[in-house]
């Protein structure tokens, strides 16, 4: 029986999904199967089906690994001689960079005067709840650049967004040229949304999910990584080298301060910045260009490659020390990653035993700080945030399964990199 307290949900491979939630299943040995969409139906059943691919208008479409639908080769002469930016694939439909579209049924808490605006920017789909201006005319009209309807002659809408606006990656998509919904329609009764549950930093199309839907900005991003040459990332026409960070600049929303993108070799990895619930001062202030409030008069003390303030915060989020120990004996490598926390005061040690590249044993132990201090071989490698640790542990769960049945050489080392907090661009978060 799957109904509890009149709240229906679905179970798929030991994970819980809300009614209306959609995701790509994670299936061995392929990983995320992008050609299959699953949805949690009202009766608690999961329905999965193959993505229907749109017709491509070229003679020899190419099939790119990790993308479902074939597409026209990038080498084709661009239409109208415009420089082509990275497009977005969503639900079997390709959107061009800068293209805006409307999604329905995404937000449970959509107000009657709000609509869902989605935008494709450099391969990422961003959706936001847009608060529409009050209409003063009887017959408002739709405009191409907004999900809100406007009065004739009102001119172009500004794209300011209030603190209460919510962004989300879409789960379902209205027909590309559908008639925009009136913002006085009742909000949709069913909630959709949600992404494949896979840590963003390690997947080809990462999902960054915010669990607590509190006030402020909720961000979900899907990253389509096409193969690029050279050790750089290109975003919004700008080139970033490995390790550089920036805030995405979206045509629809301007600079999104609460999302930080980092160039990891050639992959753009974006994540939501979590602001702390408590600050070390009584009256933190909101500063232009920063996502989180800051305490006045505090100068940030910088560690190599990382930006922390004197209370051990990184971009407003508390940080904790990460230790590592690597011990080799009789052809067996024991690698330990440890996170020291204050609440509760303990050390969480993740132990990996690897022989000839195959994972022999993986376990987690929680020990007191005193006990930890007596353990040999550990050295401090970085400080990290709880949100990065969460991404690390999710990725760890995936690769612990994967590496027990096949040879893994760099997977764990690559995953540990998630814990390193890069210095953000110009010291901004």
């Amino acid at each position: 029986e799957q109904v509890k307290h009149s709240e229906t949900y679905c179970m798929f491979q030991d994970k819980k999904y809300r009614v209306g939630e959609r995701w790509h299943p994670y299936l061995e040995p392929y990983g995320l199967v992008y050609c299959v969409n699953c949805i949690c139906s009202e009766n608690g059943n999961v329905l999965c089906s193959r993505v229907r691919c749109p017709n491509v208008h070229c003679l020899s479409p190419v099939h790119i690994p990790h993308l479902c639908c074939p597409r026209c080769p990038d080498s084709l002469p661009p239409v109208n001689n415009k420089v082509t930016s990275k497009s977005c694939e969503y639900n079997g439909t390709t959107y061009q960079h800068g293209e805006l579209f409307v999604a329905e049924g995404l937000f449970q808490n959509r107000q009657p005067n709000q609509c869902t605006q989605c935008s494709c920017s450099e391969g990422n789909v961003y959706c936001g709840l847009k608060t529409c201006p009050k209409l003063t005319c009887a017959f408002p009209v739709s405009v191409p650049d907004s999900c809100c309807r406007v009065c004739r002659g009102d001119g172009e809408l500004s794209w300011e967004h209030s603190d209460g606006d919510i962004f989300r990656q879409p789960a379902n998509r209205e027909a590309r040229h559908s008639y925009h919904r009136s913002h006085y329609d009742p909000p949709p009764s069913r909630q959709a949304g949600g992404l494949s549950r896979f840590p963003g930093a390690r997947s080809h199309r990462g999902a960054l999910m915010d669990s607590q839907q509190a006030s402020g900005t909720i961000v979900q991003i899907v990253i389509n990584n096409k193969h690029k040459h050279g050790q750089v990332c290109v975003s919004n026409g700008k080139t970033y080298s490995h390790g550089e960070s920036w805030h995405p600049n979206l045509r629809a929303f301007g600079i999104v301060e609460c999302v930080l993108c980092t160039c990891n070799v050639t992959k753009q990895e974006c994540k939501k910045i979590h602001c702390p619930n408590r600050y070390p001062c009584k009256y933190p202030q909101k500063i232009d260009g920063k996502c989180c409030k800051v305490c006045p008069g505090k100068k940030a003390k910088e560690l190599p490659g990382q930006s922390f303030d004197n209370k051990g915060y990184f971009c407003g989020e508390e940080t904790m020390p990460v230790y590592e120990s690597v011990f080799m004996e009789d052809g067996e490598t024991t690698r330990k990653i440890a996170l020291e926390t204050e609440r509760p005061p303990q050390v969480e040690v993740h132990v990996w035993t690897i022989r000839k590249g195959i994972l022999q044993h993986f376990h987690i132990e929680k020990i007191s700080k005193r006990m930890f201090e007596e353990l040999p071989h550990f050295k401090l490698v970085t400080r990290t945030t709880l949100s990065q640790w969460k991404i690390f542990t999710e990725g760890e769960a995936q690769i612990s399964q994967m590496c027990s049945s096949r040879v893994c050489r760099t997977e764990l080392e690559d995953l540990v990199k998630v814990l390193y907090l890069e210095r953000s661009e110009k010291g901004h978060c």
């Epitope: 798929f12 040995p29 299959v36 329905l47 089906s49 994967m402 049945s405 040879v407």
Partner: antibody, heavy 118, light 107 residues
């Protein structure tokens, strides 16, 4: 076009081993998993396991873990299944099949008949 | 292991009839179900996957449906060439398992 060509019929003695092959063509060998399925005469289908040339990942049905060994040769785009300590219970037709990226066994080999008899 | 049960070992039908072959899983398999057709002396041939997606080249008289534990393969108008063995298979969890098969025969 996609093809899976399996080796010819085998007549083997009890206790011996046999190595069946499945040669893939018409697609990128390392991108798809090859599965093996057993069918005894007049009976249903039983899944033995898979080999994924892309990563070397192997998954066995526990029932066949001590019976079958899956290997591959990337240079010839061939997956092998070795059956050991054969008994009359192992007399069957063995099929190899390709698992598409969207999780469908879309192409099958013609099958290899193995007869265990003294 | 998940057990896939095809309750009818044989089904008699006439050309032009509509026929439904059923398959029941011992637990929820979340539409991770495929249907195969096998003719004597041949390899199985994929018809339907993910419970309802018709494989390329399969005539549209074949449709798949179902969710949870109950799945159905329907042939809307049986043709002579459809007389064969039909197997359902789950790929929700390993070991992947097949139903015992349903043989479609002419009355």
């Amino acid at each position: 076009q996609v093809q899976l060509q399996q080796s010819g019929a085998e007549l083997v003695k009890p206790g011996a081993s046999v190595k069946l092959s499945c040669k893939a063509s018409g697609y990128t060998f390392t991108e798809y998993t090859i599965h093996w399925v057993k069918q005894r005469s007049g009976q249903g289908l039983e899944w033995i396991g898979w080999f994924y040339p892309g990563s070397g990942s192997i998954k066995y049905n526990e029932k066949f873990r001590d019976k079958a060994t899956l290997t591959a040769d990337k240079s010839s785009s061939t997956v092998y299944m070795e059956l050991s300590r054969l008994t009359s219970e192992d007399s069957a037709v063995y099929f190899c099949a390709r698992l598409d990226r969207d999780y469908a066994m879309d192409y099958w080999g013609q099958g290899t008949s193995v007869t265990v008899s003294s | 292991d998940i057990v896939m049960t095809q309750s009818h070992k044989f089904m008699s039908t006439s050309v032009g009839d509509r026929v439904s072959i059923t398959c029941k899983a011992s637990q929820d398999v979340s539409t991770a179900v495929a249907w195969y057709q096998q003719k004597p002396g041949q390899s199985p041939k994929l018809l339907i996957y993910w419970a309802s997606t018709r494989h390329t080249g399969v005539p549209d008289r074949f449709t798949g449906s179902g969710s949870g534990t109950d799945y159905t393969l329907t042939i809307s108008s049986v043709q002579a060439e459809d007389l064969a063995l039909y197997y359902c298979q789950q790929h929700y969890s390993t070991p992947w398992t097949f139903g015992g098969g349903t043989k479609l025969e002419i009355k």
